[in-house]
């Protein structure tokens, strides 16, 4: 039921990468608008994206307070020009979004190799450590910062001149690999949080080989 | 309830080729890597190699880089091992086993591979 | 390849006793050293990973010690269920290493 031509949104959806955090739903507004509210399971509702025509709402600035609490966003429809108008139970049109843990559940960034370094028979490889948005002491929080030794990088890497892969891991953003020398490598990573049931691996950074400009040689 | 179940095992003689299977129920393998290692009879345990299953990649022991090969189907959540030009020295339990990347926490029962004429 | 060399390769010890195994990597390994347990027909069973950290359902008796290149399970008090063969594992780069194994005999 609710007020005439006014229907609520369906299909909540959380869509979070390194803490940025959007909640989407259905459907476009026809004749109505939409506003956001999200609290924490034993917070106050807070209201985000007031009459809005989206169907989306960034919610990052809520969740990166604490990134370990459990979050619920509802979205309520109101009809386009009269956003005083309730349902015929006396209240807006609402519908609750599933539950949101973003500590557990954001989705891991494709991670980006920084330099590798070639000191005679030894590759150091460096992962970027991304900045995300959750802050600490007025400072932005890097992802290690974040999850400490919770977030694991797995890197491959192969000669360039063959396709057998070998593989190295590090709960750091730095490997320290043998490479047989005068041979170029070429080098992937991704992330892994282990104690994660979901979301637990990004994609595959993009390939990044030696001889090619990321890289520096020492004998 | 997180299960490994090897299958493919038995007789087979020097020179052919035999597939394990190991399904997998209660989680999605695509998001953990998934290993393959063995043991002979009264012997140690041997890593033979893993498979990130959501994207492709394979790694080896180079000793079975040429003879082995590691696959998996994820609509199928079961991961493979082809195994050919046997020898009587692959005579061994496969094992199957999940990794979260920090530990292997969950291993099949093994099955028997018998290479023998 | 790092090797894990395993020592002792077998022991004898009596319910009570406290057993140290070790694992020597022949160069480092960073922390991703995991123990296994093994019994006759089954599986491995996980104790111990990240080198000191113990796996869930693992009795507290359990632990293990150690970086770089050398890695120690202890037993603090043997019971009748633990005799049993004892693997560690490498598994900061490949190709993975497993130690010998050490079997925990009944004195």
């Known amino acids: 039921s609710g007020t005439t031509n006014t229907v609520a949104a369906y299909n909540l959806t959380w869509k979070s990468t390194n803490f940025k955090t959007i909640l989407e739903w259905e459907p476009k507004p026809v004749n109505q608008v939409y506003t956001v509210q999200i609290s924490t399971k034993s917070g106050d509702w807070k209201s985000k994206c007031f009459y809005t025509t989206d169907t989306e709402c960034d919610l990052t600035d809520e969740i990166v307070k604490d990134v370990k609490q459990t979050y619920l966003a509802r979205v309520f429809s109101y009809p386009a020009g009269n956003v005083e108008s309730t349902g015929s139970a006396g209240e807006p049109l609402y519908e609750n979004s599933p539950e949101f843990t973003p500590y557990l559940e954001t989705n891991l960034g494709q991670p980006t190799i920084q330099s590798f370094e070639q000191v005679g028979t030894k590759v150091n490889v460096t992962v970027e450590d991304e900045r995300t948005l959750v802050r600490r002491n007025n400072t932005f929080l890097s992802l290690r910062d974040v999850f400490g030794k919770d977030l694991i990088y797995t890197l491959y890497y192969w000669k360039s001149s063959s396709s057998g892969k070998k593989t190295a891991k590090t709960n750091t953003n730095e490997f320290l690999i043998d490479v047989d020398k005068g041979e170029n490598y070429c080098f992937s990573v991704q992330a892994v949080i282990p104690s994660r049931t979901v979301n637990r691996k990004s994609t595959d950074s993009p390939v990044e080989c030696m001889g090619q400009e990321k890289g520096e040689f020492r004998e | 309830e997180v299960q490994l179940v090897e299958s493919g095992g038995g007789l087979v003689q020097p020179g052919g080729s035999l597939r394990l299977s190991c399904a997998a129920s209660g989680f999605n393998i695509k998001d953990y890597y998934m290993h393959w290692v063995r043991q002979a009879p009264g012997k140690g345990l041997e890593w033979v190699g893993w498979i990130d299953p959501e994207n492709g990649n394979t790694i080896y022991d180079p000793k079975f880089q040429d003879r082995f090969t590691i696959s998996a189907d994820t609509s199928k959540n079961t991961a493979y091992l082809q195994m050919n030009s046997l020898r009587a020295e692959d005579t061994a339990v496969y094992y199957c086993?999940?990794?979260?990347?920090?530990?292997?926490?969950?291993w099949g029962q093994g099955t028997l591979v018998t290479v023998s004429s | 390849d790092i090797q894990m060399t395993q020592s002792p390769s077998s022991l004898s010890a009596s319910v009570g006793d406290r057993v140290t195994i070790t694992c020597k990597g022949s160069r480092d390994t960073t922390s991703f050293v995991s123990w296994y347990q093994q019994k006759p027909g089954k599986a491995p069973k996980l104790l111990i990973y990240y080198a000191t950290s113990l796996a869930d359902g693992v009795p507290s008796r359990f632990s293990g010690s150690g970086s770089g290149t050398d890695f120690t399970l202890t037993i603090s008090s043997l019971q009748p269920e633990d005799f049993a063969t004892y693997y560690c594992?490498?598994?900061?780069?490949?190709?993975?290493?497993f130690g010998q194994g050490t079997k925990v005999e009944i004195k």
């Open positions: 086993a999940r990794d979260t990347a920090a530990y292997f926490d969950y």
């Open positions: 594992l490498q598994h900061g780069e490949s190709p993975f290493t």
